[in-house]
């Protein structure tokens, strides 16, 4: 039975040209995290594998930085980066947990961080 929950940074905003950290945290389970995938809609951004370390998708390697931890740092943000981001935790023996973050990239300096929220 899957008992874990994913806590994410929730709805966040950032300024164009700036950077943002996407973070998820898996709690309430003793399952072992074997891999975390970061995806934007249906596009793979990065993978962090417990054995192999990071795989950054070639099309993002110049502006995606691994970490901190299992998180992901997006740099040189553009308005096109606005949208949904997903952290997909592969665990043993539970299976897969998914967290969602919505990022809004703003033209001006009105960017403000949203509240954290949980996805069971």
């Amino acid at each position: 039975m899957m008992t874990g929950t994913i806590e994410t940074t929730g709805n966040i905003s950032a300024e164009k040209g700036g950077s943002i950290i996407l973070q998820c945290h898996l709690s309430s389970t003793t399952a072992q995290v074997t891999q975390v995938n970061w995806e934007q809609q249906d596009q793979l951004l990065a993978i962090c594998n417990a054995d192999l370390g990071w795989h950054i998708s070639p099309s993002f390697k110049d502006r995606v930085a691994p970490g901190p931890g299992l998180g992901l740092t997006l740099q040189s943000l553009t308005v096109n980066d606005t949208g949904e981001y997903f952290c997909i935790y592969h665990t043993y023996p539970d299976g897969t947990y998914t967290g969602r973050i919505f990022l809004e990239v703003l033209e001006s300096s009105v960017a403000e961080h949203g509240a954290r929220f949980q996805i069971p």
Partner: antibody, heavy 119, light 107 residues
Framework: EVQLVQSGAEVKKPGASVKVSCKAS????????MHWVRQAPGQGLEWIGR????????KYNDNFKGRATLTVDKSTSTAYMELSSLRSEDTAVYYC????????????WGQGTTVTVSS | DIQMTQSPSSLSASVGDRVTITCRTS??????LAWYQQKPGKAPKLLIY???TFAEGVPSRFSGSGSGTDFTLTISSLQPEDFATYYC?????????FGQGTKLEIK
């Protein structure tokens, strides 16, 4: 066109070292991780290790830790695999292989370098 | 380490036949499995990754399926150029092991 061109065949004595090169072209070298895989005569495929050309960070198969060393020269878009303390069981074809865009599989391979270890 | 079991080790078939090769893993690897084709004296060539995604330029007669621990590579109608050795590989963790290979021969 993506190409991985490897150095020529080598004959080495037991206990010696060998360094195989893999020159990449047709893509941005630092955007893709590089792996090394070997195949003994008539046998299957065995993964040796992986290197990030940007940072030089490496990961190795436990079977090769301490004996295999992976390096890159970004200025020439070349990856290297050095294997030390050679023994007859290291006789094999050694391949460099580029990591795919969506995970830890291999989308392009070099033509292979035959390394023969014989006294 | 996750163990890979590929079967059969060899297979005789005729042009036009439908052929299936299976790969089983000792633990759940989700869909992180690739298939390669290798011809004598040549480097392996990627056919399928993520269990069912086609590599560039791979003919549609090849297809991959499966998830978890059981995977298959199917060739719907064998062509003369398909006679080769096929390997599965899980791309989910060190040591990125390959299956033992399936040699596909002409009957």
């Amino acid at each position: 066109e993506v190409q991985l061109v490897q150095s020529g065949a080598e004959v080495k004595k037991p206990g010696a070292s060998v360094k195989v090169s893999c020159k990449a072209s047709g893509y941005t070298f630092t955007n893709y991780y590089m792996h090394w895989v070997r195949q003994a005569p008539g046998q299957g495929l065995e993964w040796i290790g992986r290197i990030d050309p940007t940072s030089g960070a490496t990961k190795y198969n436990d079977n090769f830790k301490g004996r295999a060393t992976l390096t890159v020269d970004k200025s020439t878009s070349t990856a290297y695999m050095e294997l030390s303390s050679l023994r007859s069981e290291d006789t094999a074809v050694y391949y460099c292989a580029r990591e795919g865009g969506f995970g830890y599989y291999f989308d392009y391979w070099g033509q292979g370098t035959t390394v023969t270890v014989s006294s | 380490d996750i163990q890979m079991t590929q079967s059969p080790s060899s297979l005789s078939a005729s042009v036009g036949d439908r052929v299936t090769i299976t790969c089983r893993t000792s633990e759940n690897i989700f869909t992180y499995l690739a298939w390669y084709q290798q011809k004598p004296g040549k480097a392996p060539k990627l056919l399928i990754y993520n269990a069912k995604t086609f590599a560039e330029g791979v003919p549609s007669r090849f297809s991959g399926s499966g998830s978890g621990t059981d995977f298959t590579l199917t060739i719907s109608s064998l062509q003369p150029e398909d006679f080769a050795t096929y390997y599965c590989q899980h791309h989910y963790g060190i040591p990125l092991p390959f299956g033992q290979g399936t040699k596909l021969e002409i009957k």
